[in-house]
Amino acid sequence: VPRWRQQWSGPGTTKRFPETVLARCVKYTEIHPEMRHVDCQSVWDAFKGAFISKHPCNITEEDYQPLMKLGTQTVPCNKILLWSRIKDLAHQFTQVQRDMFTLEDTLLGYLADDLTWCGEFNTSKINYQSCPDWRKDCSNNPVSVFWKTVSRRFAEAACDVVHVMLNGSRSKIFDKNSTFGSVEVHNLQPEKVQTLEAWVIHGGREDSRDLCQDPTIKELESIISKRNIQFSCKNIYRPDKFLQCVKNPEDSSCTSEI
């Protein structure tokens, strides 16, 4: 008799999820010598323990605490780059500017980036058919709770000048409902963070508007100012040139506005 299985609205666990997490962990510890002491099998066991045999709508931050402990890592608090809806460029930037970090440049962020996972209550099975959708099913699902947990802690760790890359091509350049808008903004510590500097990335080559005057950016400025953190904003009119100039800052064309 086939067992009844809950059907969720979201895609199921990424195929070969255990193998992927383990392989990513091994790769990360090989690339980052300061993390070579990490026992990747223990990391996978802690990751698995956070959601296996648990109802996928009833996951808590506490479930991930064993994983958080194993992912302990040094991150220079004044070199943090947050991003919203522009992940690829943010990652391209930190691949060049190696002393800056996005969340996905940390072990925990790297492990989970672009993956989906969930289990089922009272069984040790991973659900590869479907997982809860944040909107249609429930917000306390394994993936959402993981990212909320690590994003909050990443923001809490930040100090001095914190940078955030925002997508100027979106209708809401700053979206209060994004992870940045709903979690990270509210967990920057005013006693540690002096300034939030937004980099608004332009999409069109002929777009010369000052997107720092966008109403949603003004909303972000208001939220940040009320938290006693200074706010500044820069337009990045040519992201391609921006990256090129990060790679080659001595280039003569890099003195002009980008």
Partner: nanobody, 117 residues
């Protein structure tokens, strides 16, 4: 600016005890959870223990549970780590840091604990 100064380390025999202190300044100490982390020679960073801002909630790494006790005195802006039944594998530089991790940027110089006979 967050500043911390760790002290209390030293050379101790296996089975012995030490009490580490961390004097904090530059922030409202009582509002922040605090952690002890350590780095053994040639190894990576290991989280040891954390305590809530009020001091009523604590957590420990499995490797130190039952041997180490974290505490704080908010009136003195000071964090403590009482270490009993010390083992050779506890040898490390111990740092205190704000927050519960997993992301740390330690501001102090740390204090070296050496467990050896």
């Amino acid at each position: 600016e967050v500043q911390v100064l760790e002290s209390g380390g030293g050379l101790v025999q296996p089975g012995g005890s030490l009490r580490l202190s961390c004097a904090a300044s530059g922030f409202t100490f009582s509002r922040y959870a605090m952690s002890w982390v350590r780095q053994a020679p040639g190894k990576g960073l290991e989280w040891v223990s954390a305590i809530s801002g009020s001091g009523d909630s604590t957590d420990y790494a499995d490797s130190v549970k039952g041997r180490f006790t974290i505490s704080r005195d908010n009136s003195k802006n000071t964090l403590y780590l009482q270490m009993n039944s010390l083992r050779a594998e506890d040898t490390a530089v111990y740092y205190c840091a704000d927050g519960t991790g997993p992301f740390f940027d330690y501001r102090g110089q740390g204090t070296l604990v050496t467990v050896s006979s």
